[in-house]
């Protein structure tokens, strides 16, 4: 239904706390360089204005769209051009072009320092002094670094953050309590960020239909007892919600997400038997719980998929007359039978089925042509299964850090033109798939591995798109979203690459490496490894192992030395010389 004042409507629906959080996220995602203080001032102005509209929907400007109101606020910021350059040009445009322009200027890799967690004591002090401000800073810092983070989910993580601090700041050993708990929240939030970026990429590049297909597959796996009409309704709603969030309509997105949770909880009987525990929770937790819900049990009496999609005489007629419904039904039926497949794989199978019908239906004997289509799925299913098997075996053998290094070597060979920081980030994230997925039961491994890898590779594509350097990466990234992972897996050593000259300074280290946290130390070593591969793309595994082992020993030795600086200065050149020799 239409409301006189959209901003009043959203304020009333969401409540002041969530309203303010979402407005802060929106501003932080649009203007990523502005300090917290500047954004919070705007948030307060918008909130005060919303309250006047709640009091009187006919008040001046209350009838304006939220994009218009937010855009006007952003465009009124002094020195916008000085800080944001051409983003200021957006302000010359009218809505909806202005908002589109803001979206195009979102930076997936903003030049911001990594978010440093303060010491436990300092954190607790500032949290206890002003919890609202503390959590506001959290929303701001995460949102500006992740401009596509799913806003209602970020509110949930802020709530989690709040819970952890409330609990741990009363403990005697605050750090021991905080560190593992906040690490867990951070890990979940980072995965959520790449997953949502992939959803927005899907929406931006391939439109709503592609996203809806993803949603149908996912919902069908989770709710195999729900009817197709129910799954379609849920998928349509989820598509709308994600479109809104990806498009910067965060208030509408959060409001609609809460509505969907309400709908699901009111219709548990026709959706899933697993929802009840979620439905007793408050709104943010309820939505999050529903988004992470375990799969319902598959109905016992499902007939063979072949009956309706191969043996039925009307297959071609049904396909030609309503592809969306017929192929949607195929995707639903196949997905509800296969919670053990990744969504990417299910979409590839649906695409293969569609392509087969498109090829066969006009022929003289269509059933003879498409009759073996289900058997032709086998190689498509085997490929990711083998990927999971070989990678999990490698992970079990090497551990997370060793596995990351193996992935780093592989990807540097595939795309040596890509910047070393991007390769290291991608390899570290890809390498985490082992810890995340390989320990799961067999039936959960494939969906976990492939859908996670797809999201990480999407991040690589997004970064590469900004400054394209590798034709191979461009080719994999510009194809269909579901084909990306197989495309990257199939890449081999780039034979066109001219090896980088050996620069001693790239492999020169100083005593500062000794005081770095383990993670930073690993990154330094992995940076050196990528540079080695760029210098010698065809180096054997043994050669790289020798050099990296030598390097680790060198760092270890010098960090234990009495005169660290002297050790690095004298031993460093020897290491460089030995490395050059080992790789010759």
């Amino acid at each position: 239904e239409a409301h006189k004042s959209e901003i009043a409507h959203r304020f009333k629906d969401l409540g002041e706390q969530h309203f303010k959080g979402l407005v802060l996220i929106a501003f932080s995602q649009y203007l990523q360089k502005c300090p917290y203080e500047e954004h919070i001032k705007l948030v307060q102005e918008v909130t005060d204005f919303a309250k006047t509209c709640v009091a009187d929907e006919n008040a001046e400007n209350c009838d304006k769209s939220i994009h218009t109101l937010f855009g006007d606020k952003l465009c009124a910021i002094p020195k916008l051009r000085d800080n944001y350059g051409e983003l200021a040009d957006c302000c010359a445009k009218q809505e909806p072009e202005r908002n589109e322009c803001f979206l195009q200027h979102k930076d997936d890799n903003p030049n911001l320092p990594p978010f440093q967690r303060p010491e436990a004591e300092a954190m607790c002090t500032s949290f206890q002094e002003n919890p609202t401000s503390f959590l506001g800073h959290y929303l701001h810092e995460v949102a500006r670094r992740h401009p596509y983070f799913y806003a209602p989910e970020l509110l949930y993580y802020a709530e989690k953050y709040n819970e952890v601090l409330t609990q741990c700041c009363t403990e005697s050993d605050k750090a021991a309590c905080l560190t593992p708990k906040l690490d867990a929240v951070k890990e979940k939030a980072l995965v959520a960020a790449v997953r949502q970026r992939m959803k927005c990429s899907s929406m931006q590049r391939f439109g709503e239909r592609a996203f809806k297909a993803w949603a149908v597959a996912r919902m069908s796996q989770r709710f195999p007892n729900a009817e197709f009409a129910e799954i379609t309704k849920l998928a349509t709603d989820v598509t709308k919600i994600n479109k809104e969030c990806c498009h910067g309509d965060l208030l509408e997105c959060a409001d609609d997400r809460a509505e969907l949770a309400k709908y699901m909880c009111e219709n548990q009987a026709t959706i899933s038997s697993k929802l009840q525990a979620c439905c007793d929770k408050p709104v943010l937790q309820k939505s999050q719980c529903l988004a992470e819900i375990e799969h319902d049990n598959i109905p016992a009496d499902l007939p063979s998929i072949a009956a309706d999609f191969v043996e039925d005489k009307e297959v071609c007629k049904n396909y030609a007359e309503a592809k969306d419904v017929f192929l949607g039904t195929f995707l639903y039926e196949y997905s509800r039978r296969h919670p053990d497949y990744s969504v990417s794989l299910l979409l590839r199978l649906a695409k293969k089925y569609e392509a087969t019908l498109e090829k066969c239906c006009a022929e003289g004997d269509p059933p003879a042509c498409y009759g073996t289509v289900l058997a032709e799925f086998q190689p498509l299913v085997e490929e990711p299964k083998n990927l999971v098997k070989t990678n999990c075996e490698l992970y079990e053998k090497l551990g997370e850090y060793g596995f990351q290094n193996a992935v780093l070597v592989r990807y540097t060979q595939k795309a040596p033109q890509v910047s070393t920081p991007t390769l290291v980030e991608a390899a570290r994230n890809l390498g985490r798939v082992g810890t995340k997925c390989c320990t799961l039961p067999e039936a959960q491994r494939l969906p976990c591995v492939e859908d996670y890898l797809s999201a990480i590779l999407n991040r690589l594509c997004v970064l590469h798109e900004k400054t394209p350097v590798s034709e191979k990466v461009t080719k994999c990234c510009s194809g269909s979203l579901v084909e990306r992972r197989p495309c990257f897996s199939a890449l081999t050593v780039d034979e066109t690459y001219v090896p980088k000259e050996f620069k001693a300074e790239t492999f020169t280290f100083h005593s500062d490496i000794c005081t770095l946290p383990d993670k930073e130390k690993q990154i330094k070593k992995q940076t050196a490894l990528a540079e080695l591969v760029k210098h010698k793309p065809k180096a054997t595994e043994d050669q790289l192992k020798t050099v990296m082992g030598d390097f680790a020993q060198f760092v270890d030795k010098c960090c234990k030395a009495a005169d660290k600086d002297n050790c690095f200065a004298t031993e460093g050149p020897n290491l460089v010389a030995r490395s050059k020799e080992a790789l010759a």
Epitope: G207, R209, C316, Y319, A320, E321, A322, K323, D324, V325, E354, L357, E358, K359, C360, C361, A362, E363, G364, D365, P366
Partner: antibody, heavy 119, light 110 residues
Framework: EVQLLESGGGLVQPGGSLRLSCAVS????????INWVRQAPGKGLEWIGI?????TTFYATWAKGRFTISRDSTTVYLQMNSLRAEDTAVYYC???????????????WGQGTLVTVSS | DIVMTQSPSSVSASVGDRVTITCQSS???????LSWYQQKPGKAPKLLIY???KLTSGVPSRFKGSGSGTDFTLTISSLQPEDFATYYC???????????FGGGTKVEIK
Amino acid sequence: EVQLLESGGGLVQPGGSLRLSCAVSGIDLSNYAINWVRQAPGKGLEWIGIIWASGTTFYATWAKGRFTISRDSTTVYLQMNSLRAEDTAVYYCARTVPGYSTAPYFDLWGQGTLVTVSS
Amino acid sequence: DIVMTQSPSSVSASVGDRVTITCQSSPSVWSNFLSWYQQKPGKAPKLLIYEASKLTSGVPSRFKGSGSGTDFTLTISSLQPEDFATYYCGGGYSSISDTTFGGGTKVEIK
């Protein structure tokens, strides 16, 4: 050489009927889909319908009921009933690119036959 | 209702010019089922591009198709004398019965 050749056009009175033929040579018709497309004088192209190799037919929403497509081993037909002045057009038959069934990719066309509906 | 809007309806250009024709579809076409045809007076149309961007065999590389979903473009990078003609886009949808052509764009000599 592959050829599609339409015939059967001419002057017909409003309310009348006409059957157009599309003779296909140089290919085995039993493996291809054939479409009918029309073009009113000075106007754009308008898809009428398709017949698959199996004989299954589909029509544009506006064409259902008045137009019927059929085929034999070498010829595809378009039966047009209850003709109106606005049906005046050049009628083409065209082959769908092999490997496609429902896509609007027509690689071989006849030269067209003019149908004039007038009293 | 399916609407396929081609623009401009006509364009005057000279040999060597770059010409761009757009085709907007509502709703979006199915699976990039979008084709471009060239038609000269008194002749049947000729398929230039299918699947939005694939060139039919024998079609010169100065013809380029791009786009996806609802917005598509045909670009002729350097117009040749034989390119003066009318161009049509054709779209396929969820239902084959909705197969539609755009209104056409006439490329004339300036």
